[in-house]
């Protein structure tokens, strides 16, 4: 069964700056990744970035840099200034659309006890939804 993992890290240098990393553990080819915050995409969450493996990347504030890390994982840096900046308990979600598995989404937030610059290892987050 495919899994999606989500890792959220607060940057030591900028305490209101976050890095979100997401990955897809499955055999299919990824056709789209959507990163949102405040809940799952389409369920109250606000889209931060949409990444297509070949067409390109679209991102919106406070997202500063979305990029592919590997063929099955992405990262997103969030700028921590202004009214729309994230806080420590913000939930971030990543939805991977892949063929032939369908869509798989998982969410994560900053570990409660984490120090700036540290984070839990990127273990699979609970899968919230699988749309086949």
């Amino acid at each position: 069964t495919p899994e999606v993992w989500v890792q959220v890290r607060m940057e030591a240098t900028e305490l209101s700056s976050f890095t979100i990393r997401c990955g897809f553990l499955g055999s299919g080819s990824i056709s789209l990744v959507t990163v949102s915050w405040g809940g799952p995409n389409g369920a109250g969450g606000t889209t931060l970035a949409v990444l297509h493996p070949e067409r390109g990347i679209r991102q919106w504030a406070p997202a500063r840099q979305a990029r592919w890390e590997t063929q099955s994982s992405i990262s997103l840096i969030l700028e921590g200034s202004g009214a729309s900046s994230p806080c420590a308990n913000t939930t971030f979600c990543c939805k991977f659309a892949s063929f032939p598995e369908g869509s798989w989404e998982a969410c994560g937030s900053l570990p409660p006890s984490s120090d700036p610059g540290l984070s839990a290892p990127p273990t699979p987050a609970p899968i919230l939804r699988a749309d086949l």
């Epitope: 606000t46 067409r55 390109g56 679209r58 990029r67 592919w68 063929q71």
Partner: antibody, heavy 114, light 113 residues
């Protein structure tokens, strides 16, 4: 198949504003950004910016910041581009586009002339 | 901003012959993470909006004839029409899809010789 249908041609006076609409059908309007691109007569393509209808999040080309506003109405699946303080060099065909420029509207000619 | 420069500005090719258009970007369009080049090619005929031909430097958009092909990596890219047809007369644009703002080349006008 996504279809984008734009509003008709406009003739405007210098200093005024124009608002161009782009109605989408056949796809999920809120999932992908609506891009705006303009093309002056005989010239190339110039990206103006984009709006993500689901959240009204926007990105603007620095060249147009302060003069252009993107809005979207999810209830009618329509995106809007408003350009203010028009000058003669804004005479161009304005296009909306979606899904990484895979789908395009037919274009709206805006003529700025006194 | 990434500057896209196409060559030549115009090109005349006989029907059935090969047409080649080059595009050079001022910065690399290669995403090192997934080894994909974020470059697209468009065809525009008079009075019509641009039509997406190629994305990811080499992937044909659905419905595009296989005589159109894209190649290249990093900063140097090529659009090739293997056997020119009358309906291919148009202006062709390359586009940076790698970073904001998306920027287009100045265009290459393709005509029949």
């Amino acid at each position: 198949e996504v279809q984008l249908v734009q509003s008709g041609a406009e003739v405007k006076k210098p200093g005024s504003s124009v608002k161009v609409s782009c109605k989408a059908s056949g796809g999920t309007f809120s999932s992908f950004s609506i891009e705006w691109v303009r093309q002056a007569p005989g010239q190339g393509l110039e990206w103006m910016g984009e709006i993500l209808p689901g959240s009204n999040s926007t990105n603007y080309n620095e060249k147009f910041k302060g003069r252009v506003t993107f809005t979207a109405d999810e209830s009618t699946s329509t995106a809007y581009m408003e350009l203010s303080s028009l000058r003669s060099e804004d005479t161009a065909v304005y296009y909306c586009s979606s899904y990484w420029f895979a789908y395009w509207g037919q274009g709206t000619l805006v003529t700025v002339s006194s | 901003d990434i500057v896209m420069t196409q060559s030549p500005d115009s090109l005349a090719v006989s029907l059935g012959e090969r047409a080649t258009i080059n595009c050079k970007s001022s910065q690399s369009l290669l995403n090192s993470g997934n080894q994909k080049n974020y470059l697209a090619w468009y065809q525009q005929k008079p009075g019509q909006p641009p039509k997406l031909l190629i994305y990811g430097a080499s992937t044909r958009e659905s419905g595009v004839p296989d005589r159109f092909s894209g190649s290249g990596s990093g900063t140097d890219f090529t659009l090739t029409i293997s056997s020119l047809q009358a309906e291919d007369v148009a202006v062709y644009y390359c586009q940076n899809a790698h970073s904001y703002p998306p920027t287009f080349g100045q265009g290459t006008k393709l005509e029949i010789k």
